[in-house]
Interface confidence: low
């Protein structure tokens, strides 16, 4: 019977000939008098074969991620009958692997988004790599994942590639951010080769900023013929928040002679004051009202920022007409 | 470990002015909102004022309004309380807080110092 | 504001038996934003239950919080002597209150 072992080459062997190992019939006692053949897909090509002693020789270069593994056939003939000594056998050559593949993010690009002050711990993305070399051959293919740029914002986890927030942030102070994420395979020991992508994190909104008046004092005029649900003037507050979070209402907060009403103007975020009694002149010549400013739409969890309104002092000064 | 450690505290007559301080340590203080509450002798706690971890919001209680000023140094890892026209009751020990990260509770307190308001 | 109403104001037990102290606010306390401390004379607070049941790190688990609403509990299932102390409860729900205290002592 044929007596072999499991061949294997190593892949990317840089030789011009390197031994396979060796094809044998029990019967040959080893007096040159019998043949061996190769055939099949690779025969004579990628492989040949020593015909006297049946060494297997691979003569080219392999690469597994091409091509694992061949399947050939072999013959034992004698020589001085030229009929075969055993039965025709398949028998396989497999290609075994080295780490010659560097970790590939496949995805790219990578974009998250991510509401800005969400606690440590909240997962962004989870970023992946693959590596051709083969996943059963040692650590060839097992990845490490690890930060090269994103500290102290941002986490990786490093047999995961999820990404996680390790450090609060600002949207006020900063909107995006590029984190640099690196694939190690081998996990990481000596001769490991590696591949980066990067990710772009943007923040949302929230709203973690109250409306703040640009004034802490107004000055307004209004003409003591002026009729009631005239516009007397403007007032205007800022938020660093964006969209629906920067919306804001403003009201009285004191008025005791309840003479002004404000009103939102909801498309230019400002409060326009109106006269809600006729005001006289010999009467009273000059109003002070308080104003207060709170966002449209609060998030109870958020309520810890909004909750002392801003506030502004408006100094309304009747304007004289001369009656007949 | 976390550690917050008040100074400043002292005898000071009515009218008079304070700065109270808090070392922070063992955390990024930058990422925390930060608390002082008070405690009359024999009495119990009283919350007296927050600032946000970037130190852009601050609220009072309606006591201290207009008197306190809380602030905070984050290249110090300091937070600060001035306290100005000080009154009899105002007297208390003063702790500073740590508001703990996933909810307003507060997690760290200081050991406390007192303040002592009398002529 | 939201006052918070502690009671009773002293408890006196016996180390082994069970503690169950309340705290009623004035108001809804919302999604359950409440806090217990402890305080022991010369020393600062420390935080044993947030949102009214969840333990703070290192807590034994004696100790457990309930409630919603304006009712909440704290109960100390077995008093060992390290737990006679002062106990306060918080709201952080609008803005922040403390509850007057309880005090448990030794009977």
């Known amino acids: 019977g044929w007596v072999w072992n499991q061949f294997f080459v190593p892949e990317e062997m840089n030789t011009t000939s390197h031994h396979v190992g060796r094809l044998r019939s029990d019967l040959d006692n080893g007096n040159n008098s019998f043949q061996y053949k190769l055939l099949g897909a690779g025969a004579g090509s990628t492989f040949i074969i020593d015909e006297r002693t049946g060494d297997i020789y691979a003569i080219e270069k392999l690469d597994r991620e091409e091509r694992s593994l061949y399947i050939l056939r072999a013959q034992v003939i004698d020589i001085t009958t030229g009929r075969a000594v055993e039965p025709e056998s398949e028998f396989v050559i497999k290609v075994s692997d080295i780490n010659d593949n560097e970790p590939k993010f496949l995805d790219e690009p990578y974009e998250a988004i991510v509401p800005e002050m969400s606690p440590e711990g909240t997962l962004v993305i989870q970023v992946t790599a693959s590596d051709a070399d083969d996943p059963s051959s040692g650590n060839n293919a097992r990845l490490l994942y690890s930060l090269l740029q994103g500290q102290p914002y941002f986490s990786v986890e490093p047999t995961t590639g999820v990404i996680r927030i390790s450090s609060k942030m600002d949207r006020e102070l900063q909107d995006e951010y590029w984190v640099i994420i690196q694939a190690k395979d081998m996990i990481g020991q000596p001769g490991a080769l590696s591949g980066t992508t990067s990710v772009l994190i943007k923040l949302s909104d929230v709203n973690d900023n109250k409306p703040i008046f640009k004034e802490s004092l107004y000055r307004l005029t209004v003409s003591e013929s002026a009729p009631t649900g005239t516009s007397i003037g403007t007032i205007m507050a800022y938020d660093n928040d964006i969209g629906e979070n920067a919306e804001m209402d403003y009201s009285i907060e004191e008025d005791d002679s309840q003479t002004f009403d404000i009103i939102t103007n909801h498309e230019t975020q400002e409060g326009i004051v109106i006269l809600k009694k006729k005001v006289n002149f010999e009467h009273q010549n000059h109003y002070g009202i308080r104003a207060k400013v709170k966002n449209h739409h609060v998030d109870e969890q958020l309520m810890k920022y909004h909750t002392e309104a801003s506030t502004t002092f408006i100094k309304i000064q009747v304007e004289d007409v001369d009656e007949p | 470990q976390v550690q917050l450690v008040e100074s400043g505290g002292g005898v000071v007559q009515p009218g008079g002015s304070l700065r109270l301080s808090c070392a922070a340590s063992g955390f990024t203080f930058s990422s925390y909102d930060m608390h002082w509450v008070r405690q009359a002798p024999g009495k119990g706690l009283e919350w007296v004022a927050v600032i946000s971890y970037e130190g852009t919001n601050e609220y009072y209680a309606e006591s201290v309004k207009g008197r306190f000023t809380i602030s905070r140094d984050t290249s110090k890892n300091t937070l600060y309380l001035q306290m100005n026209s000080l009154r009899a009751e105002d007297t208390a020990v003063y702790y500073c807080?740590?508001?703990?990260?996933?909810?307003?509770?507060?997690?760290?307190w200081g050991q406390g110092t007192l303040v002592t308001v009398s002529s | 504001e939201i006052v918070l109403t502690q009671s009773p104001g002293t408890l006196s037990l016996s180390p082994g038996e069970r503690a169950t102290l309340s705290c009623r606010a004035s108001?809804?306390?919302?999604?359950?934003?409440l806090a217990w401390y402890q305080q022991k004379p010369g020393q600062a607070p420390r935080l044993l239950i947030y949102?009214?049941?969840s333990r703070a790190t290192g807590i034994p688990d004696r100790f457990s919080g309930s409630g919603s609403g304006t009712d909440f509990t704290l109960t100390i299932s077995s008093l060992e002597p390290e737990d006679f102390a002062v106990y306060y409860c918080?709201?952080?729900?609008?803005?922040?209150?403390f509850g007057q205290g309880t005090k448990v002592e030794i009977k």
């Open positions: 108001q809804s306390v919302s999604n359950t934003y």
């Open positions: 949102g009214a049941s």
């Open positions: 807080a740590r508001e703990r990260y996933f909810d307003w509770s507060f997690d760290y």
């Open positions: 918080q709201q952080y729900s609008n803005s922040w209150t």
